[in-house]
C-alpha cells in the first residue's frame, strides 16, 4: 500500500475546520475490514484518530477530529480537524495498514489575520517641530508572529528607533505593539504595516501630523 499526502503545508485559520488530506490506492476486492488507519502527531506519537478492526475508533484528540467514512473504501483517509487552535499546529502522520503498511506526514500551519492597526501618539498635544514623539502601532489577535514595517510619507523605510513586542494571549494569538520614536518635522505621515507571513496579509495603519491639530485618516 502506498500513502500519499500533500507536500505543501495545510494552512488553516483559527476557529475554522481543516482537512489533512491522505490517500491510498485500494487493491481490487479491498474491504474496510482489512483497513487499519492511524492518525497521530508525528513528534510525540500521540494518537489523534484511528480506524481499526473494521470500525471507526473515534477521536482521541479533544473530540475534534473525524474521518470521511463513506470515502474510506475509495482510499480517502483524510482527517477533518474542527475548530482549529494554535496548539494544533504541527506535523501529523497518516499510517495505513492493509496487507502491508505505509505512512506519510502532513504539516498543519495555523494562521489568524491581524486586526487593522490602531495608532496612538505620546505626547498627543502641544506638539512642535523638533519634538520627540512616540508613535505606537497596535494590532491584535494574529498568528503567527507578525513582521512590522514603518515608513514615512515618502515611503522611505524607518528602521531606527523602532521597538516591537509581541505577546501571546491565552489562545496563543499574538498582540503586536510597535513603537516608533521620531523627531517631528513641520508635518509628516507615518505608517506602519503589520504583515502576517503565512497569510501574506498586510494590515496598514497611519498617522498624519500637520502642525496643529493632529489628524488621523478615517478607518478604511
Amino acid at each position: 500500500v502506498e500513502v500519499q499526502v500533500s507536500e505543501d503545508p495545510v494552512v488553516a485559520l483559527v476557529d475554522t475546520d481543516a482537512t489533512l488530506r491522505c490517500s491510498f490506492s485500494p487493491e481490487p476486492g479491498f474491504s474496510l475490514a482489512q483497513l487499519n488507519l492511524i492518525w497521530q502527531l508525528t513528534d510525540t506519537k500521540q494518537l489523534v484518530h484511528s480506524f481499526t478492526e473494521g470500525r471507526d475508533q473515534g477521536s482521541a484528540y479533544s473530540n475534534r477530529t473525524a474521518l470521511f467514512p463513506d470515502l474510506l473504501v475509495q482510499g480517502n483517509a483524510s482527517l477533518r480537524l474542527q475548530r482549529v487552535r494554535v496548539t494544533d499546529e504541527g506535523s501529523y502522520t497518516c499510517f495505513v495498514s492493509i496487507q502491508d503498511f505505509d505512512s506519510a506526514a502532513v504539516s498543519l500551519q495555523v494562521a489568524a489575520p491581524y486586526s487593522k492597526p490602531s495608532m496612538t501618539l505620546e505626547p498627543n498635544k502641544d506638539l512642535r517641530p523638533g519634538n520627540m514623539v512616540t508613535i505606537t502601532c497596535s494590532s491584535y489577535q494574529g498568528y503567527p508572529e507578525a513582521e512590522v514595517f514603518w515608513k514615512d510619507g515618502q515611503g522611505v523605510p524607518l528602521t531606527g528607533n523602532v521597538t516591537t513586542s509581541q505577546m501571546a494571549n491565552e489562545r496563543g494569538l499574538f498582540d503586536v505593539h510597535s513603537v516608533l520614536r521620531v523627531v517631528l518635522g513641520a508635518n509628516g505621515t507615518y505608517s506602519c504595516l503589520v504583515r502576517n507571513p503565512v497569510l501574506q496579509q498586510d494590515a496598514h495603519g497611519s498617522v498624519t501630523i500637520t502642525g496643529q491639530p493632529l489628524t488621523f485618516p478615517p478607518e478604511a
Epitope: V1, K45, T52, T93, S97, Q99, D100, S103
Partner: antibody
Framework: QVQLQQSGAEVKKPGSSVKVSCKAS????????ISWVRQAPGQGLEWMGG????????NYAQKFQGRVTITADESTSTAYMELSSLRSEDTAVYYC????????????WGQGTMVTVSS | EIVLTQSPATLSLSPGERATLSCRAS??????LAWYQQKPGQAPRLLIY???NRATGIPARFSGSGSGTDFTLTISSLEPEDFAVYYC???????????FGQGTKLEIK
C-alpha cells in the same frame, strides 16, 4: 538491503532481566515493523512481540504480557527486547526480524542472541 | 488466540519427490499466512508470504496455496538442500501479532 545486528550472548541468573538489542542498517528504520521471536533448544519458533517504531506502538504475545518490554530508538535505528523475571525455561536463542520498509512478512532476521538462564 | 496445527510432524521423502505440508488454523486468518524454512544453527528463512507469494530469491519449486483455515506448502521436486524444518505463521490484522505452527520436519528417507 536491510540488515539486523543483534547484541552478544548473555548468561543470566533466575529472577534477573535481560535486554537484547537489534540495530538496523540500510533502510528507513521508523517504517519497519520489528518482531522478536525466540527458540528454545530443540523447540519451535515462538513470537514474543513486536513494535512499529513510527507509531511507537508495541504489542505482545499473551504468554509474555507483563514480562516483556519492546522499545525502539529511532535516533540509533535500534530495537530492544527486555525480558524480566527470568527462569530456566527462558534459555533460548532470541531473534529480531523485519520485513523492511512497510512489510510485515519476516524476511530479514538478525543472527540471534543466545540467552542462558542458570543459577 | 489463533492456534496453527501443522501436519505431519515429520515427513520422510527422497530427493526428487513431491512434498506437501499442511497448516490448519483454528479460525480464519484470511490470507495472512507465511511459510519459513529453518536449518540447524540458522535463522529462519521466509519462503512464502500472504499464502501464495514467493519471497525474493525463493526457487519456483516452492509454492503456497489456501485461504481461510487450510493452507498448503508444496515443494514440487525435492532437492537435497530442502531437508529442514518448515514452519507456518499467521499474522493477525491489528495490532499485527504473529503465531507460529509447531513445525514439520522434512527428512531424507
Amino acid at each position: 538491503q536491510v540488515q539486523l545486528q543483534q547484541s552478544g550472548a548473555e548468561v543470566k541468573k533466575p529472577g534477573s532481566s535481560v535486554k537484547v538489542s537489534c540495530k538496523a542498517s540500510g533502510g528507513t528504520f521508523s517504517s519497519y515493523a520489528i518482531s522478536w521471536v525466540r527458540q528454545a533448544p530443540g523447540q519451535g519458533l515462538e513470537w514474543m512481540g513486536g513494535i512499529i517504531p513510527i507509531l511507537g506502538i508495541a504489542n505482545y504475545a499473551q504468554k509474555f504480557q507483563g514480562r516483556v518490554t519492546i522499545t525502539a530508538d529511532e535516533s540509533t535505528s535500534t530495537a530492544y527486547m527486555e525480558l524480566s523475571s527470568l527462569r530456566s525455561e527462558d534459555t533460548a536463542v532470541y531473534y529480531c526480524a523485519t520485513g523492511g520498509s512497510g512489510r510485515y512478512a519476516l524476511d530479514i532476521w538478525g543472527q540471534g542472541t543466545m540467552v542462558t538462564v542458570s543459577s | 488466540e489463533i492456534v496453527l496445527t501443522q501436519s505431519p510432524a515429520t515427513l520422510s521423502l527422497s530427493p526428487g519427490e513431491r512434498a506437501t505440508l499442511s497448516c490448519r488454523a483454528s479460525q480464519s486468518v484470511s490470507s495472512y499466512l507465511a511459510w519459513y524454512q529453518q536449518k540447524p544453527g540458522q535463522a529462519p528463512r521466509l519462503l512464502i508470504y500472504d499464502a501464495s507469494n514467493r519471497a525474493t530469491g525463493i526457487p519456483a519449486r516452492f509454492s503456497g496455496s489456501g485461504s481461510g483455515t487450510d493452507f498448503t506448502l508444496t515443494i514440487s521436486s525435492l532437492e537435497p538442500e530442502d531437508f529442514a524444518v518448515y514452519y507456518c505463521q499467521q499474522r493477525s490484522n491489528w495490532p499485527p501479532s504473529y503465531t507460529f505452527g509447531q513445525g514439520t520436519k522434512l527428512e531424507i528417507k
